[in-house]
């Protein structure tokens, strides 16, 4: 996965800090106040979508080869820049019964991006 | 995740069989000769992109929160119909040294789809 640099337009990971107060979630999330969630952005042209390290999976590489060899549209839509690696984050929050709960929430932080 | 039934155009899983011969991989993959890779297709309108069952994660929900409020840099970030659950499959193939290898290859089969 590639981190977004200056004028990069290809699929990459953009660092981004989310503030829970800013999105109105501070009333139920106690800790942390925010976190570096990051997100994926950029283009996935067919010629790079199947490249190792850029393709999200073996599955992606297979479909992109098919897309390149067959009429467009036979195997789904365009390739999309999406998370390929994520990690969890511990959250301290109020549940629906106002109990304080500490849980590892999966897939909170985007670590790498690739073309779907 | 939804199964595509031809009636909906919302993000769903489409059944699809890949023949390794069709993509020119039959020279190094011994078995199987192909498999049901499946793929994701369909629309991810903003009102469903963050809903449970169609969304990828907490992360998607946060991004959708920003997107729906027109926040930069998310305003132009399109939600994509992508695999949310992939499964491995065993394959028998020749490695670079022409040894026959049996291995569980990760992320081969799309089991479920959702909106990124």
């Amino acid at each position: 996965g590639i981190d977004c640099q200056g004028g990069s337009r290809m699929c990459c990971r953009q660092e981004f800090f989310v503030d829970f107060r800013e999105i109105g979630w501070h009333d139920w999330i106690i800790q942390p106040e925010g976190y570096a969630m990051n997100f994926c952005i950029g283009q996935c042209p067919l010629h790079i979508a199947g490249m190792p390290g850029i393709a999200a999976s073996f599955h992606t590489a297979v479909l992109n080869l098919l897309k390149a060899n067959t009429a467009a549209g036979t195997t789904g839509g365009g390739s999309c820049c999406v998370p390929t690696a994520r990690r969890p984050l511990s959250l301290l929050y109020y549940d629906r019964d106002s109990n304080i709960v500490k849980t590892d929430i999966p897939d909170m932080v985007v670590e790498a991006c690739g073309c779907s | 995740g939804l199964e595509c039934d031809g009636k909906v155009n919302i993000c769903c899983k489409k059944q699809f069989f890949v023949s390794f011969k069709d993509i020119g991989w039959n020279d190094w993959i011994i078995a199987p000769s192909g498999y049901h890779a499946n793929y994701c297709e369909g629309e991810c309108p903003s009102h469903i992109a963050g809903t449970s069952g169609s969304s990828l994660s907490f992360h998607s929900t946060v991004i959708n929160h920003y997107r729906m409020r027109g926040h930069s840099p998310f305003a132009n970030l399109k939600s994509c119909c992508v695999p949310t659950k992939l499964r491995p499959m065993s394959m028998l193939y020749y490695d670079d040294g022409q040894n026959i290898i049996k291995k569980d290859i990760q992320n081969m089969i799309v089991e479920e789809c959702g909106c990124s």
Epitope: - | A31, P32, H36, R87, M89, S90, L92, N99
Partner: antibody, heavy 123, light 108 residues
Amino acid sequence: EVQLVESGGGLVQPGRSLTLSCAVSGFTFDDHAMHWVRQAPGKGLEWVSGISWNSVSIGYADSVKGRFTISRDNAKTSLYLQMNSLRVDDTALYYCVQDLNDILTGYPLFDFWGQGTLVTVSS
Amino acid sequence: DIQMTQSPSSLSASVGDRVTITCRASQSISSYLNWYQQKPGKAPKLLIYAASSLQSGVPSRFSGSGSGTDFTLTISSLQPEDFATYYCQQSYSTPPITFGQGTRLEIK
């Protein structure tokens, strides 16, 4: 977790029929060829029959050809063996086996086995 | 049809011994040979595929060699859990798929 559960075995008289079933879970059934392998009491393994993922290709051992019929239902993720004109020497533990391959040619490799169902042919 | 012949049909050995089982094909099968282990009352288990490749999770004391018509399965240092019956199987010319008659490995 891959599971293959055979059923339908039992005691049967020579000349009669029996149908074995194998219920499968834990993998994409229609990506794999499936087989029946039998083992007579105290004897070795004998391949009985195999069927490709789409039922297009089917094979039988000479010893059962014309008497046994293999079939599969991909929607029900089940494998079957219809055994007609049973003989005393068909007495065996019948295993349902998942092939790594999807077709019968190429490289069949028996990846996962059920625990077997016992068929006893006796008068 | 390709016939597979194993030898010996039975063998007695002690823990720590090095044991070799052979399998011969009636015609060349390249390296399309697999070995299975079966313990009493259990289903067979894949040990070695493609003549010499160890199935994932199988201890490294097991090894396979050979190509063409002659193949061997070697256990470098027998462990108590290795006493079982071993079968070779050809995957070259199929169907039919043929097994060797088996080699029973017993404690001396």
